[in-house]
């Protein structure tokens, strides 16, 4: 057959859906690969064709849109399952074509089983709440487009296995779940189950997300350098190993890049000729405040090295700080000779 | 002082009328705690003398009435056996003129002052009156565009205005008014509410509508030929499958051998907003086994059926 622009298997979109629930999957061509949308393509006379390859098979086959109760159907650029079955797992391809143009992309779809407590292999999105920050809300995700706005679904929220009822500081409000004061004890997996009717049938959508309570912006400070500091002097003899830790505390800041680096005589270690290595370790507190340690190491320090300026720098969205390490050459103890 | 600071969203209030704010913050206030109110980080607590215009009443701060100069940040400190929380509430007071159309929109009204009625439904508005037990509220009067609401579609029940069969005309500016009595003195409370109407949304355009058939029966003589159209409206750019089924099987498959009942070729007429599709089912010869069986027209997720019936005997 004639050539087709094949975008291959789009593994960026590892789509996971729950078994026995409706799923609507948009053809990724219009989302990520083509400049025009489905309506433009359709009005230009292009046809969208779907097919799939079952799990552990090589054979591409057309999708059967003539199943009982229209279990699988297509609407515009959306592939609908009402509902999914476990053996719908596979690689799905959508192809846009007419006699002169062709473009296609494949993506993996995994139908996942869940237990009665909503545990499953599903990768969970993480929603961060600021600790003790006032009222914050999470919203039941990815339910748009499943039912019209005239349908009033029933929404039930769970924390782990427990229905959220009479919780002290967590209040279900339809599609939203409100946290009056987020505390560490609110960390966990939260599930909304949306139940809606369609054509005499009742469908359930299960959405689980992980809530992580993090440091509040009102408590955030610029980076704090704990080491080096004025109380520690790195006194070495030539030939000894020089180890200087730079330990920096970063308040949690949403979407902030935390950086730590050393300069030696104002230059980055890579830009100077001395044999220096830097090892980094990172630890986090329960509220995702971060402590980064970069250890500068010179295996055999020379007297020249001991005269250099060693400065630790740190930067976050809150600001930039720097601190010089106190490095000096150890004065040899005087030798007394007995005449 | 070791107190944890908690910041509440701003409250926007109107001058010259009572206002109260309750310092409760579950789970903090669920145990044995003491609550003290302060203004603008002052070290002196708000008075507890009930004759004071601004005073603390149990866990509440009460303004009788609120005045323009009362804007500011108020703190309530909740002390437990081994905890302390300081809650900051930013109160902004403005002069409101509900019936002065020259005044622009109110600044960032909270949800209590923006409410929704649903078109075609029996719905309600709520008058949010949050005051301590020491305040006695009289019956509530409701106004729309500055006129008292009268009429059989409206009923006042407790703090609710019940609205029957909501129409588009019910959108607009409402106010609820109540007389509050405290220590023998009377004050007027007037809350403005901006009401919008949500339309009765159709099926987002993506669910096809079957115009005919309508889940009904058709009288037809045994042995005759019958053609029934399924008429469907759908969006211009839909990709829905339209077909006839019996016993959950496509009629062309179900009658594959005899070909006695067949699905016709689909045609469509294009309109400005939608397409009208027609796909027929042809019974070359109606047999006894066809009676009482639902023949289903499917269009995407929509379905409708016909059932063939023997005509009633004519005894003339």
């Amino acid at each position: 057959s004639e050539r087709c622009d094949d975008w291959g298997l789009d593994t960026m979109r590892q789509i996971q859906v729950f078994e026995d629930e409706p799923a609507r999957i948009k053809c990724p061509l219009f989302e990520h690969f083509l400049k025009f949308n489905y309506s433009t393509a359709h009005s230009a006379g292009l046809t969208l064709i779907w097919y799939w390859t079952r799990q552990d098979r090589d054979l591409e086959e057309p999708i059967n849109f003539r199943l009982p109760e229209n279990r699988i159907s297509k609407e515009k650029d959306v592939l609908w399952f009402r509902p999914t079955l476990l053996n719908d797992t596979g690689n799905y391809t959508c192809m846009l074509r007419n006699t002169t143009y062709c473009s296609k992309v494949a993506f993996p779809l995994e139908v996942v089983q869940k237990d009665s407590c909503f545990n499953s292999p599903m990768k969970l999105p993480v929603h961060k709440l600021y600790i003790e920050y006032g009222i914050q809300r999470i919203t039941c995700p990815n339910v748009d487009g499943y039912f019209p706005s005239s349908v009033k679904p029933t929404i039930t929220w769970y924390m782990g296995c427990y229905k959220i009822q009479n919780f002290n500081n967590v209040i279900p409000e339809g599609m939203n779940l409100s946290f009056l004061i987020a505390l560490i004890s609110n960390n966990g997996n939260y599930t909304c189950v949306v139940t809606y009717p369609e054509n005499g049938r009742t469908f359930h959508l299960t959405r689980t997300l992980t809530v992580k309570v993090v440091g509040s912006p009102k408590n955030a400070v610029p980076p704090v350098i704990h080491s080096p500091n004025d109380h520690v002097v790195y006194e070495k003899e030539p030939g000894e190993e020089l180890l200087i830790p730079c330990t920096v505390y970063f308040s949690f800041l949403m979407d902030s890049r935390n950086e730590v680096w050393w300069t030696i005589d104002g230059k980055k270690p890579d830009d100077i000729t001395i044999d220096v290595t830097i090892n980094e370790s990172i630890s986090h507190s329960r509220t995702e405040d971060e402590t980064r340690t970069q250890i500068l190491s010179i295996k055999k320090v020379t007297s020249e090295d001991l005269k250099r300026s060693y400065v630790c720098h740190a930067r976050s969205a809150k600001g930039e700080v720097a601190k010089a390490a106190k490095v000096k050459q150890k004065v040899p103890a005087p030798r007394y000779t007995v005449e | 002082d070791g107190c944890k600071d908690i910041f509440m969203k701003n409250e926007i209030l109107s001058a010259s009328q009572p206002f109260a704010f309750n310092c409760t913050f579950p789970p903090i206030t669920s145990g044995e705690v003491s609550v003290t109110w302060y203004k603008n980080s002052s070290k002196i607590p708000v008075s507890k003398i009930i004759q004071s215009r601004i005073h603390q009443d149990e866990t509440w701060i009460l303004f009788l009435p609120m005045e323009w100069g009362d804007s500011g940040v108020y703190q309530c400190v909740i002390k437990g056996r081994d905890s302390c929380h300081r809650i900051h509430v930013n109160l902004t007071v403005f002069e409101k003129h509900w019936c002065d159309t020259s005044i622009g929109g109110l600044p960032n009204l909270s949800d209590e002052y923006k409410q929704i009625l649903h078109l075609g439904k029996d719905d309600s508005l709520t008058c949010h009156l949050h005051f301590p037990k020491s305040c006695v509220l009289g019956p509530i009067k409701w106004y729309k565009d500055c006129n008292e609401i009268k009429g059989e579609r409206f009923t006042v029940l407790e703090t609710r205005l019940l609205v029957s069969n909501v129409s588009a005309e019910d959108r607009g500016n409402y106010a609820c008014q109540a007389i509050l009595t405290h220590s023998g003195k009377q004050y007027e409370v007037l809350n403005g509410i901006t009401v919008s109407i949500t339309e009765r949304a159709g099926y987002g355009g993506s669910v096809p509508k079957i115009i005919y058939p309508k889940n009904h029966s058709i009288e037809v003589q045994l042995g005759t030929t019958l053609i029934v159209d399924c008429n469907v409206t759908d969006t211009k750019d839909n990709t829905n499958l339209r077909c006839w089924r019996v016993n959950n099987t496509l009629v062309d498959d179900y009658y594959d051998e005899s070909k006695r009942i067949r699905e016709g070729v689909e045609t469509h007429v294009s309109f400005r907003e939608h397409n009208l599709y027609t796909v027929n089912i042809t019974f070359l010869e109606v047999k006894m086994e066809d009676y009482g069986l639902p023949f289903m027209c499917h269009a995407g997720v929509s379905t409708a059926y016909i059932i063939l019936q023997l005509p009633a005997p004519d005894f003339r």
Partner: antibody, heavy 118, light 107 residues
Framework: EVQLVESGGGLVQPGRSLRLSCAAS????????MHWVRQTPGKGLEWVSV????????AYSDSVKGRFTISRDNAKNSLYLQMNSLGTEDTALYYC???????????WGQGTLVTVSS | EIVLTQSPATLSLSPGERATLSCRAS??????LAWYQQKPGQAPRLLIY???NRATDIPARFSGSGSGTDFTLTISGLEPEDFAVYFC?????????FGGGTKVEIK
């Protein structure tokens, strides 16, 4: 054609619970408030409870407050009345009724009989 | 709560006669009053709402009047099927309340 069909009534001992259901058809269920009304030979008609279309407004008569709970499932076109701590004074024919102008009743079911007796 | 008192308790009339039923409220219910008809073994049926509006499919011989605390249901010419019990009901205040009923019987 509007139809309201109650179920769940029966003989129950004092202090026990019962759940009544009402299946609605023939109208757009989630446009209207729904009510429970009961009737006894001695006390005549007595309004029990109301629930708005979206369950936002709920009210009870003083005689059942704290013991009865009204609820609805618009997806199933169903109205419910959970009755706890039943007493002999709750013996009645229970009707479910569709709200008209909110708090009039333009359609009624045929009723389900609840008898509380030891 | 608002108490509705109906009178008379029983009204004995012949077919074709005019029936006048009264309902008095313990406090004003404005125009929020309805009338229902109930026949033995059947559920009540809405006749009149908001004092004077006839419900769907209710014949013109049924009419309502009054305001505030005093209300009247009039049946201009009794038909055989009109012999039943009639209740009034208010929706001005919670709890919603009914009158005790007036029985219209054949004389």
């Amino acid at each position: 054609e509007v139809q309201l069909v109650e179920s769940g009534g029966g003989l129950v001992q004092p202090g026990r619970s019962l759940r009544l259901s009402c299946a609605a058809s023939g109208f757009t269920f989630d446009d209207y408030a729904m009510h429970w009304v009961r009737q006894t030979p001695g006390k005549g008609l007595e309004w029990v409870s109301v629930i708005s279309w979206n369950s936002d407004v709920i009210a009870y008569s003083d005689s059942v407050k704290g013991r009865f709970t009204i609820s609805r499932d618009n997806a199933k076109n169903s109205l419910y009345l959970q009755m706890n701590s039943l007493g002999t004074e709750d013996t009645a024919l229970y009707y479910c009724a569709k709200g008209h102008n909110w708090n009039f009743f333009d359609y009624w079911g045929q009723g389900t009989l609840v008898t509380v007796s030891s | 709560e608002i108490v509705l008192t109906q009178s008379p308790a029983t009204l004995s009339l012949s077919p074709g006669e005019r029936a006048t039923l009264s309902c008095r409220a313990s406090q004003s219910v404005s125009s929020y009053l309805a009338w229902y008809q109930q026949k033995p073994g059947q559920a009540p049926r809405l006749l009149i709402y908001n004092v004077a509006n006839r419900a769907t499919d209710i014949p013109a011989r049924f009419s309502g009047s009054g305001s505030g605390t005093d209300f009247t249901l009039t049946i201009s010419g009794l038909e055989p099927e009109d012999f039943a019990v009639y209740f009034c009901q208010q929706r001005s205040n919670w709890p919603l309340t009914f009158g005790g009923g007036t029985k219209v019987e054949i004389k």
